[in-house]
Interface confidence: medium
Amino acid sequence: GPETLCGAELVDALQFVCGPRGFYFNKPTGYGSSIRRAPQTGIVDECCFRSCDLRRLEMYCAPLKPTKSA
């Protein structure tokens, strides 16, 4: 059956994918389309109740910090 990711395993996988950037359980506001759906889709909906791959997990990483110029 489809593989799902829940609880502590979900957090562990997010830490693997996102590193110290951190992550959100809901996509950051303004992610992708500017039109927000209601209710907001979260990672538990996408990866625990359904299956998702590592690229999908990456969508829940915190945004990259802007590069500081030397």
Partner: antibody, heavy 115, light 105 residues
Framework: QVELVESGGGLVQPGGSLRLSCAAS????????MSWVRQAPGKGLEWVSY????????GYADSVKGRFTISRDNSKNTLYLQMNSLRAEDTAVYYC????????WGQGTLVTVSS | DIVLTQPPSVSGAPGQRVTISCTGS????????VHWYQQLPGTAPKLLIY???KRPSGVPDRFSGSKSGTSASLAITGLQSEDEADYYC?????FGGGTKLTVLG
């Protein structure tokens, strides 16, 4: 001490299958996610697949998605990689690596795909 | 996707200091943890530096890591012949292309 020992490599024809194993000891096996990483002859390292510590979640590199399957048996402290539809470009040494930092590696097992 | 670029080779004489760079393209690696691996000839990779600058137990303090902006660096001081190896940086599941360190003489 932590020990990871791979086995199951060998020579296989294109389109064939192999199953690699990685036997683990010296740590609490069920507390760590595991990965397979490969290295083609004379080339660099390429991450292949990831499995969460309970085994309920897996992830794959695009190059192997749909052909390889990672699994684990937490009662036997063993990690597996089932490789189907093998191609010449899958020829490599395959390593199992522990955790998300790849802090321990096995010695590797060579897979050669050739006719 | 993250791409990590390393110089193909570096060299130095025994006792010298060498550095190996790891540069991220299209993503700011300053937001990630960078890990470094050493692969001696004919052996499996070994974790050398994790989380940018931390050394696992057993790794000599001649090895150090740092990170700034879009690049990370591995420094080796007091170069020894046994340091001759391939060195790889990584971010999560992405590896750099590797750098071959040659110890001269």
């Amino acid at each position: 001490q932590v020990e990871l020992v791979e086995s199951g490599g060998g020579l296989v024809q294109p389109g064939g299958s192999l199953r690699l194993s990685c036997a683990a000891s010296g740590f609490t096996w069920s507390s760590f996610a595991m990965s397979w990483v490969r290295q083609a002859p004379g080339k660099g390292l390429e991450w292949v697949s990831y499995i969460s510590y309970l085994g309920s979640y897996t992830g794959y590199a695009d190059s192997v998605k749909g052909r390889f399957t990672i699994s684990r048996d937490n009662s036997k402290n063993t990690l597996y990689l089932q490789m189907n539809s093998l191609r010449a470009e899958d020829t490599a040494v395959y390593y199992c690596a522990r955790g998300t930092k790849f802090d321990y590696w096995g010695q590797g097992t060579l897979v050669t795909v050739s006719s | 996707d993250i791409v990590l670029t390393q110089p193909p080779s570096v060299s130095g004489a025994p006792g010298q200091r060498v550095t190996i760079s790891c540069t991220g393209s299209s993503s700011n690696i300053g937001t990630y943890d960078v890990h470094w691996y050493q692969q001696l000839p004919g052996t499996a990779p070994k974790l050398l530096i994790y989380s940018n600058s931390k050394r696992p137990s057993g790794v000599p303090d001649r090895f150090s890591g740092s990170k700034s902006g879009t690049s990370a660096s591995l420094a080796i001081t007091g170069l020894q012949s046994e340091d001759e190896a391939d060195y790889y940086c990584s971010i999560t599941r992405v590896f750099g292309g590797g750098t071959k360190l040659t110890v001269l003489g």
